[in-house]
Amino acid sequence: KSPVFGPQEVSSVEGNSVSIKCYYPPTSVNRHTRKYWCRKGASGRCITLVSSEGYVSSNYAGRANLTNFPENGTFVVNIAQLSRDDSGHYKCGLGINSRGLSFDVSLEVSQGPELPNGTEVYTVDVGRTVTIKCPFKTENAPKTKALYKKIGQTSVLVIDSRNYVNPNYKDRIRLRIPGTGQLIFTVVIDRLRLSDHGLYLCQAGDGSNRDEKNADLQVLEPEPELVYEDLRGSVTFHCALGLEVANVAKFLCRVNSRETCDVVINTLGKRDSAFEGRILLNPQDKDGSFSVVITGLRKEDEGRYLCGAHSDGQLQEGWPIQAWQLFVNEESTIPRSPTVVKGVAGGSVAVLCPYNPKESQSLKYWCLWEGAQNGRCPLLVESQGLVQEQYEGRLSLLQEPGNGTFTVILNQLTTQDAGFYWCLTNGDTRWRTTVEIKIIEGEPNLKVPGNVTAVLGETLNIPCHFPCKFSSYEKYWCKWSNTGCQTLPSQDEGPSEAFVNCDENSRLVSLTLNPVTRADEGWYWCGVKQGHFYGETAAVYVAVEEKKVAGSRYVSPAKADAAPDEKVLDSGVREIENKAIQDPRLFAEEKVVADTGDQAGGSRASVDSSSSEEQGGSSK
């Protein structure tokens, strides 16, 4: 299917002008190639009428032009002084006329209505309000005022000053007669319907002295705004319906093949399941305007969308609406990032998030989509640090690998972490993406002891067991802080035969803190990576206490994979009972340890990677 997109139907009246905007993927080639507007003939050939290279056909001379906007990926064709002869089938496109990089546009130019002299024309969008002004002479001031609608040769009474209201206008029409001295009455019609379209007649008085005024009411369906977005990207519909419906329920719906409109989301809590995890209805402003964001755009999301207001939260005739025609470009610049990432309970996930690579300096964010009511997405972490305290020690956002991708690591997974998350930046909003985290059955690959207590001034050794499948990857320990995870210096003692062959059930990478200081308190992560790509991580909390007894503190490698509810009391180490203590304040006195940067600098902290049989080995 062609990636060029424009309006399918354009209609106007003789003598008027039209402006036709066509969209194209703004690749370097497309931006600079020829743009054209051509008319399809009976033979199927398309004859150029105007092009970006300066050509204008004789038929269009002096009344048409084509302007390219390469930075937006659009071009606009303006045609003035329209005549009935301009009605027909056209194409806007790129390159050569027959190549197929084009979009079909139907232009219909109709004759303007034959209106009686002095007719006032009112042009109003459906759902809005019109005020029809009706002048009268002094002698008709005390007489009956009325508004009729002309249907064929007959006139049907709509409203009069004797309190008659036509049932079709019930609860949405009023006739106002001003005070003395003002020789004009007004008829206000709210929530206009398409059926209200037509010629009206104001009348004051009767007989040959009556005052009459013709009013032509044109009720228009809102012209859909064309929206051109990339596959997998994000779209925002801004909906401003006016103060008069500020307190009425709002909705966004999509027009289906039966020309009815299926609710996508509304403020009453309804949401189409096809948009689960990837839609938000942003709160209303005081003026009643709101916006709807949809991420992870799919080809099947294409179509006509309407936003509106009604107490039922769905489309009803005569209520204000706004319209969009969404086109989803399959020649997307947005990469196919994961829609689902799976992790095991107790384990971790490393989520890769795409961003516009031209915006490497932009702030990166990760939020949790919540479906309740209109949906919301509270930020959990940003590139400058953690946002939500309850994720302390288990969430980090890394700028790596860079060049259009950042990484979010979440560990200590529980079933509560299952759900939808959004990758965002403060730059190009079209690059918002959604990922679903699923918790599956299985065991974490990395095994670390539960939370440990270290003694000031002594040596602490924390083992991390990894399986053979990770043997060829880089292993690391890092100290978590709310601004990231600072890698600790590693000791690479060269690979041993046993390590290279990985003939044991598991391998060991150990963190040594020597001597332990107050600043060492906190969360530590053991992880595997390949270059800038992160795999599994496991977290352990180290509490620091005053020296009570002599002797070094050491978590025995042999006991490091003890079950979570076991206590490892080897070599004088006391392990905190596993009570799912995610928050260190529950067992460490209320003390804030400032992150001093390289807290494990110099030779104080070291990482040793070895087999469980020998202390030699490699961390690579």
Epitope: R336, P338, Y355, I440, G442, F533, Y534, G535
Partner: nanobody, 138 residues
């Protein structure tokens, strides 16, 4: 939806070879990692091998390492399991499975090692075939 159909199973003598195929249809085959599992009577489903979406990364169960080779042909939407030096304990129903793999196209989301994902657990996979019987006689 993705539909998976296995073929190539049969009866073979110990020390012999078989080549299993799994043809996929439906959604984009090239964005899925493909795995093989097996289930012997009265036993749990066991991981055999997995291959990343590009074919650039593979991972095998210790019990088949060096004997089995997994490969894929994205043009044909097919994944293969070449089984050599077969043993009686390889007798089982072999299942093909597919799971969406993070980083399944370029330019900005490169491929992560398949070992970084919990692909040895059946619950990681989204779609399964009906299975093909492999019997190794002694």
């Amino acid at each position: 939806q993705v539909q998976l159909v296995e073929s190539g199973g049969g009866l073979v003598q110990a020390g012999g070879s078989l080549r299993l195929s799994c043809a996929a249809s439906g959604r984009t085959f090239s964005s899925y990692a493909m795995g093989w599992f097996r289930q012997a009577p009265g036993k749990e489903r066991e991981f055999v091998a997995v291959i990343s979406w590009s074919g650039g990364s593979t991972y095998y169960a210790d019990s088949v390492k060096g004997r089995f080779t997994i490969s894929r042909d994205n043009a044909k939407n097919t994944v293969y399991l070449q089984m050599n030096s077969l043993k009686p304990e390889d007798t089982a129903v072999y299942y093909c499975a597919s799971g969406e793999q993070p980083g399944s196209n370029r330019p900005y989301i490169p491929e992560q090692p398949i070992e970084f994902m919990p692909t040895d657990y059946p619950s990681w996979y989204d779609y399964w075939g009906q299975g093909t019987q492999v019997t190794v006689s002694s």
